[in-house]
């Protein structure tokens, strides 16, 4: 309605004597700013005067404030939006209706707010969820319809009069919609909290009690049980009787069914609070408990461990591990059902008692072949001695022992012979299945453990064999001691260390890598001609004519071997130089004359130099000197010089004669 002023505030506010009240309030006037404000207590409209009568708690006009109870009552608003009020302290007789008389330039309005002030602090209100179950977290809420800035309060939670350990979250609201103080407590109740009293206590700032609210907890929980057994230690012998009783200490709601469990499995036809076991057997040993159910679920008692004692049963032996490898460790375990556990053991190896072995386990750190056989044991406890079981078999495996390689041939062996060898051994577990030979070769094995080497090589020095089961055992190598003709015969230059120059002293050595037998003879030859019978061939002063192809031979009682041909190269400076002329030493002028420098040199000539009859050098560096066109004045003696890495050589003079052409003679 556009003709109304618009106000927002809580409908009713609550407080108690001596506290305070804070009234959150907003408004919107019909026109303009607020010019006058009066706070009435229980206002009555007077029709005669057309004004409101009642106690004026606060007044403010454009002319200034009227000092009534100005200090106790405060207008905290403004001229256009806020109409918040505070009364501090508040009294019992403040209860009733507050009237906010508002006037603007042209409009007036009376807004009513209810105030409920009690004589004493009123109690807060505890809110509980509809159902509480053990161990499920719930939130307890304590609500008080009061909050005021000038009067701080606190809400505290108590369980059976004792402050609760859990941290509560307190919140306040002072808004135009609501005014309250609230405390929320998160809490996981246990079955033992059932029926306990929870209190929310209102306190002032100093912790002084103001009021409270209480509730009794109704915690739904499964039945809580206690089990009793006769005899109390639950240890009996076969044939004895046992009684177990189940007592319910608490259940909410009431229980509905009872049952008994052994090792987690339900016992049939046992639905009373007492379980009677007559003439028990060892099979009845185990963990017993009773189970009682209600609408929340089943509850179980603690377990009672019933032990039915008996003498050891026939024993078995477990071996870790069989078959065992020689040198490894092995553990034997004597297994026998008994209660109480056996206190003493007797061990047997192949029927014979093993001295000093009285434990459940026997450990052998390093197994040897003789440890193989049958192992059995006997267990003993306070009720008697068990029987010896069938025992377990230990198989000890090991590589072949005492392996040897044997040569079957008569000695000595010569290169090219056929050699037969056998591989022998003393014992093996498991059996030998194959043989290996070192070194490897394309050899034949005519039967298991026999090797045949056709055309034995000079370098077949030693042979070893291995006999193999799961492992291979190698024999020591045997020497074949093969005899052969000298090998790798070659010619080696001993001196000079560098290249051979004409005039040098030269020594050649006839080398070979090996010979068996060692006694040898030497022969040197060049072009099929025998030169000497020593290991060395010596030249005091080598000449170019000594160059050529040399071979040496070495022989022993088995045969003889020749070296590859070795080329002896003699380096020498250019020699036997001469100048040849083409087409001849007499040439007609105008034609072409070619002079060639011929020589014998090792290495070949690398540089040529040409000279005329006055020893003047001509600008040519090659073997041929070409004069074209040749002139009469070119007639004369020419010579050449050849150079290689060893030295220089020069030719004698060769004369070129250039004669006049018929044309020149004709012109004269």
């Amino acid at each position: 309605d556009s003709s109304k002023w618009v106000f927002e505030h809580p409908e009713t506010l609550y407080a108690w004597e001596g506290a305070c009240v804070w009234i959150p309030c907003t408004y919107r006037a019909l026109d303009g700013d607020l010019e006058s404000f009066i706070l009435f207590h229980n206002p009555e409209y007077n029709k005669n005067t057309s004004k409101f009568d009642g106690t004026r708690l606060y007044e403010s006009t454009k002319d200034g404030k009227v000092p009534s109870e100005q200090k106790r009552v405060q207008f905290l608003g403004d001229k256009n939006k806020n109409c918040t009020l505070s009364i501090h302290p508040v009294h019992l007789n403040d209860s009733g209706q507050l009237g906010l008389r508002m006037e603007s330039k042209t409009e007036k309005w009376m807004e009513r707010i209810h105030l409920n002030v009690s004589e004493r602090p009123f109690p807060p209100h505890i809110q509980l969820p509809p159902e509480i179950q053990e161990s499920q977290e719930v939130t307890l809420t304590c609500l008080l319809n009061f909050s005021c800035y000038g009067y701080p309060i606190q809400l505290q939670w108590l369980l059976e009069g004792v402050p609760m350990r859990q941290a509560a979250v307190t919140s306040t609201s002072l808004t135009i919609k609501s005014v309250f103080t609230r405390s929320e407590l998160k809490f996981s109740p246990q079955w033992s909290h059932h029926g306990k009293i929870v209190t929310c206590q209102l306190q002032d700032a100093d912790g002084k009690f103001l009021s409270n609210d209480t509730v009794q907890l109704n915690v739904k929980h499964t039945p809580k049980l206690e089990i009793k057994v006769t005899p109390s230690d639950a240890i009996v012998r076969e044939g004895d009787s046992v009684t177990m009783t189940c007592e319910v200490s608490s259940s909410n709601p009431e229980y509905t069914t009872v049952s008994w469990l052994k090792d987690g499995t339900s016992l049939k036809k046992q639905n009373t609070f007492t379980l009677n076991l007559r003439e028990v057997t060892k099979d009845q040993s185990g963990k017993y408990c009773c189970q009682v159910s209600n609408d929340v679920g089943p509850g179980r008692s603690e377990e009672v461990f019933l032990q039915v004692q008996y003498a050891p049963e026939p024993s078995t032996v477990q071996i870790l591990h069989s078959p065992a490898v020689e040198g490894s460790q092995v553990e034997f375990l004597c297994m026998s059902l008994a209660n109480p556990l056996p206190t003493n053991y007797t061990w047997y190896h192949n029927g014979k008692e093993m001295q000093g072995r009285t434990e459940e386990k026997v450990h052998i750190p390093k197994i040897l072949p003789w440890h193989a056989g049958t192992y059995s044991c006997v267990a003993e406890n306070i009720l008697g001695t068990g029987q010896r079981g069938p025992g377990a078999e230990l198989d000890v495996q090991y590589p072949p022992k005492k392996v040897t390689t044997v040569i079957q041939n008569p000695m000595p062996i010569r290169e090219g012979d056929t050699v037969t060898l056998s591989c022998n051994y003393n014992s093996s577990n498991p059996s030998v299945t194959r043989y290996e030979w070192k070194p490897h070769g394309a050899w034949e094995e005519p039967s298991l453990g026999v090797l045949k080497i056709q055309n034995v090589g000079w370098d077949n020095t030693t042979i070893a064999c291995a006999a193999c089961n799961s492992w291979c055992s190698w024999a020591s190598p045997v020497a074949l001691n093969v005899q052969y003709a000298p090998r790798d015969v070659r010619v080696r230059k001993i001196k000079p260390l560098s290249e051979i120059h004409s005039g040098n002293s030269v020594s050649l050595q006839c080398d070979f890598s090996s010979s068996h037998p060692k006694e040898v003879q030497f022969f040197w030859e060049k072009n099929g001609r025998l030169l000497g019978k020593e290991s060395q061939l010596n030249f005091d002063s080598i000449s170019p004519e000594d160059a050529g192809s040399y071979s040496c031979w070495v022989n022993n009682s088995i045969g003889q071997t020749a070296s590859k041909a070795w080329t002896l190269e003699v380096l020498y400076a250019p020699r036997r130089l001469r100048v040849s002329m083409s087409p001849g030493d007499q040439v007609m002028e105008g034609k072409s004359a070619t002079l060639t420098c011929e020589s014998d040199a090792n290495p070949p000539v690398s540089h040529y130099t040409w000279f005329d009859w006055n020893n003047q050098s001509l600008p040519y560096h090659s073997q041929k000197l070409r004069l074209e066109p040749v002139k009469v004045q070119h007639s004369g003696a020419y010579w050449c010089q050849g150079t290689n890495s060893v030295g220089k050589g020069r030719s004698p003079l060769s004369t070129l004669t250039v004669y006049y052409s018929p044309e020149t003679i004709g012109r004269r």
Epitope: D612, W613, S617, P619, S622, Q623, Q633
Partner: antibody
Framework: EVQLQQSGPGLVKPSQTLSLTCAIS??????????WNWIRQSPSRGLEWLGR?????????DYASSVRGRVSINVDTSKNQYSLQLNAVTPEDTGVYYC?????????????????WGQGTMVTV | QSALTQPASVSGSPGQSITISCTGT?????????VSWYQQHPGKAPKLMIY???NRPSGVSNRFSGSKSGNTASLTISGLQAEDEADYYC????????????FGTGTKVTVL
């Protein structure tokens, strides 16, 4: 300092004779450790050695086979100069012509390089 | 007699090193140690830079060096400078019956 100064016409008609002269200063045409060369350069043939003359106990000359028969190198010892004559020229003989010295000894060892060049003459046929 | 073979062009940035190759036969480059190298700027006569494979005439910078392997000679210019931009020719004595000297095809060096 050795210098070579070239002279001669820059334009020659086809079939005529091309004549160029190279005057030597700072060295002698009679030197027995030098040769005196003619080299030409054209875009189509690059640098091309044509011939040389030199004096030892007498005068010698060598020519490239590409011009042999129509080339001659002459010496005027009195003027310390040498010249190139190329007969029966064709447009293929167009190019820059250089005279150059080849010094054949570098101390005691043999050498061979064109160490001094003339300024070059552009000849158009 | 065909000319000695050189790459048509080689380029490099200032301060870099470049190498020019010159390939002949056993009758020229491979047979004699008389290989020389010439620098030619546009409109100018060639200038001798290296003679007898690896010798430098006085006045030529030591940034220029020469070498030979088999039938191939090489000119290396290290610490390239702007003034090195020019044409470069190799030359060799030859035992050919048609010539006494043979020149290379020439290489244009560009400084980037």
């Amino acid at each position: 300092e050795v210098q070579l100064q070239q002279s001669g016409p820059g334009l020659v008609k086809p079939s005529q004779t091309l004549s160029l002269t190279c005057a030597i200063s700072g060295d002698s045409v009679l030197s027995n450790s030098d040769t005196w060369n003619w080299i030409r350069q054209s875009p189509s043939r690059g640098l091309e050695w044509l011939g040389r003359t030199y004096h030892r106990s007498t005068w010698y000359d060598d020519y490239a086979s590409s011009v042999r028969g129509r080339v001659s190198i002459n010496v005027d010892t009195s003027k310390n100069q040498y010249s190139l004559q190329l007969n029966a020229v064709t447009p293929e003989d167009t190019g820059v012509y250089y005279c150059a010295r080849d010094r054949l000894q570098d101390g005691n060892s043999w050498s061979d390089a064109f160490d001094v060049w003339g300024q070059g003459t552009m000849v158009t046929v | 007699q065909s000319a000695l073979t050189q790459p048509a062009s080689v380029s490099g940035s200032p301060g870099q090193s470049i190498t020019i190759s010159c390939t002949g036969t056993s009758s020229d480059v491979g047979g004699y140690n008389y290989v020389s190298w010439y620098q030619q700027h546009p409109g100018k006569a060639p200038k001798l830079m290296i003679y007898d494979v690896s010798n430098r005439p006085s006045g030529v910078s030591n940034r220029f060096s020469g070498s030979k392997s088999g039938n191939t000679a090489s000119l290396t210019i290290s610490g390239l400078q702007a003034e090195d931009e020019a044409d470069y020719y190799c030359s060799s004595y030859t035992s050919s019956s048609t010539l006494v000297y043979v020149f290379g095809t020439g290489t244009k060096v560009t400084v980037l």
